[in-house]
């Protein structure tokens, strides 16, 4: 017998559906109506046939009372080919729900987004996370998605994006967005970061995460942030292969005084990079390849410095050489 596609936990809190059959029984998902956290994975299915069964252009207000009764606050939808019209139909209906956090992962959005809706409402999300989502509309996808969301979005995460740069001219400012996470876009790079951080569109950013994004130097990131007018309090550059030295011909970049926390862990650094902010509350240099203790004049004025997992702290380890078996880091790294 095939396992049930949907499982609801004993507390009616979390419900996970894995639809892997070629012709799944979608009605199984109804057992998730009482859940607060819902995950639906569609096994890579093409949801185009759904459009034949539902009227994506129907007035969503007819479902308002039903949708308001749902407990769902966090929804994850993954592994499917979704027509843009169907996605928009779902967002319009969910605008009447209590949904606060939406995650879309491993999705291929096909077709074009319908025009701006007549009704002025939108989905009141606080968090939107996208991972490996491709859009047929190319660079304009973010602007088009904004048409169905309210402007109070607080957290935006975009990973493994096929087009991490946006059409800045079309994107509206995110006035409430305090956390932007562009991690896991290894092809982004510093030039891509400049294109993604549309000037004046992210005025409230406090936390910016750029893990594994192909960044090369802290100074290059500083320049991209300055160009975009983005002044985060906290910046995560971990898991990038950073160079410690700065191109002498590159102009010196002044970090924003708002920045008080910088994460440079797992960055392959053999020395403390040049051009760091003069003053920081937190600096994380853990799990790098520092083979000697940094000198005070190499470091910013810092309250909380983390150096764990560097070779100079591990007795009997030297700086690892290319091809050597010695990793030069403590096991935690």
């Amino acid at each position: 017998t095939t396992p049930e596609p949907c499982e609801l936990d004993d507390e009616d809190f979390r419900c996970v559906c894995n639809f892997s059959e070629p012709q799944p029984d979608w009605s199984e998902a109804f057992q998730c109506v009482s859940a607060v956290e819902v995950e639906i994975h569609a096994g890579g299915l093409n949801l185009e046939p759904f459009l034949k069964r539902v009227d994506a252009d129907a007035d969503p207000r007819q479902y308002a009372d039903t949708v308001k009764a749902l407990r769902v606050r966090r929804l994850t939808v993954g592994a499917a080919q979704v027509p843009a019209q169907l996605l928009v139909g779902a967002l319009r209906v969910l605008a009447y729900s209590r949904l606060k956090e939406l995650t879309l992962e491993d999705l291929k959005i096909t077709g074009t987004m319908p025009p701006l809706p007549l009704e002025a409402t939108g989905l009141a999300l606080s968090s939107l996370r996208l991972r490996n989502v491709s859009w047929a509309t190319g660079r304009s996808w973010l602007a088009e998605l904004q048409q169905w969301l309210k402007p109070g979005l607080k957290v935006l995460s975009i990973a493994q994006a096929h087009s991490p740069a946006f059409s800045c001219e079309q994107v509206r400012a995110f006035p409430a967005l305090t956390s932007l996470d562009l991690s896991d876009n290894p092809g982004l790079g510093e030039r891509g970061l400049m294109a993604a951080l549309c000037p004046h569109k992210f005025p409230a950013i406090q936390n910016l995460a750029l893990r594994n994004t192909g960044m090369e130097t802290p100074t290059g990131v500083c320049a991209a942030l300055a160009a975009a007018g983005v002044q985060p309090h906290s910046l995560d550059l971990s898991h990038n292969s950073l160079r410690a030295t700065v191109n002498p011909s590159a102009p010196r970049c002044m970090w924003s005084s708002a920045l008080n926390s910088l994460n440079l862990s797992f960055a392959g650094l053999e020395q403390v990079p040049k051009g760091l902010p003069a003053k920081l509350r937190v600096l994380d240099l853990s799990c790098n390849r520092l083979n000697r203790a940094p000198q005070p004049d190499e470091l910013p004025e810092v309250d909380n410095l983390t150096l764990d997992g560097n070779p100079f702290l591990v007795p009997g380890t030297a700086l690892p050489h290319e091809g050597s078996m010695n990793s030069g880091v403590v096991p935690a790294c």
Partner: antibody, heavy 115, light 101 residues
Framework: ESGPGLVAPSQSLSITCTVS????????ISWIRQPPGKGLEWLGV???????NYNSAFMSRLSITKDNSESQVFLKMNGLQTDDTGIYYC??????????????WGQGTTLTVSS | QTPSSLSASLGDRVTISCRAS??????LNWYQQPGGTVKVLIYY??RLHSGVPSRFSGSGSGTDYSLTISNLEQEDFATYFC?????????FGGGTKLEIK
């Protein structure tokens, strides 16, 4: 809205806005004021997510908070001067990033700043 | 916002204008204040809010926008404000007081 009516200069203002018929988790609330015989001035907003944005002209002395479960939004403004006199409106904001507008306005609470 | 005041008769057609300092890409709303309270009439330049009579219409683009009321009725005599919604802080025009002639 419910507020004090009369406040002395340099004192602070606290107004509570209690909403009904909708949830503060689905709608933003802005505070907008109108000095006597003048136009409308936007003070700040508290978003569905709880984040806030303020008009930079009031940033240093304005605070907007809310209690979703009690359906209440609170405005606190310090260092009042006579030119802060006016009607203070609690206003619901609705719409997506493109079609945003102030679709429901409270009746307003009148503030007079005078010694 | 122009004019600051305007006199008209029942049945007239009137137009109120609003000019922005830069292109605001149609992010302009219009509000009516008959006495104390305020209500939205038009959002995104030309979209009529639900319940607003069709004698109200909005138009414009770039920096120039207008509100037109055709066939004025008694309850239309009020103060009208435009509001730009392109960027924070949201700002309002100075208002146009429409009075009965």
């Amino acid at each position: 809205e419910s507020g004090p009516g009369l406040v002395a200069p340099s004192q602070s203002l606290s107004i509570t806005c209690t909403v009904s018929g909708f949830s503060l988790t689905n709608y933003d609330i802005s505070w907008i004021r109108q000095p006597p015989g003048k136009g409308l001035e936007w003070l700040g907003v508290i978003w569905t997510s709880g984040g806030t944005n303020y008009n930079s002209a009031f940033m240093s002395r304005l605070s907007i908070t809310k209690d979703n479960s009690e359906s209440q939004v609170f405005l606190k403004m310090n260092g009042l001067q006579t030119d802060d006199t006016g009607i203070y409106y609690c206003v619901r904001g609705d719409g997506n990033f493109y079609l945003y507008n102030f679709d429901y306005w409270g009746q307003g609470t009148t503030l007079t700043v005078s010694s | 916002q122009t004019p600051s005041s305007l006199s008209a008769s029942l049945g007239d057609r009137v137009t109120i204008s609003c000019r922005a300092s830069q292109d605001i890409k149609n992010y302009l709303n219009w509000y009516q204040q008959p006495g104390g309270t305020v209500k939205v009439l038009i959002y995104y330049t030309s979209r009529l809010h639900s319940g607003v009579p069709s004698r109200f219409s909005g138009s414009g683009s770039g920096t120039d926008y207008s509100l037109t009321i055709s066939n004025l009725e008694q309850e239309d005599f009020a103060t009208y404000f435009c509001q730009r919604g392109d960027t924070l802080p949201w700002t309002f025009g100075g208002g146009t007081k429409l009075e009965i002639k």
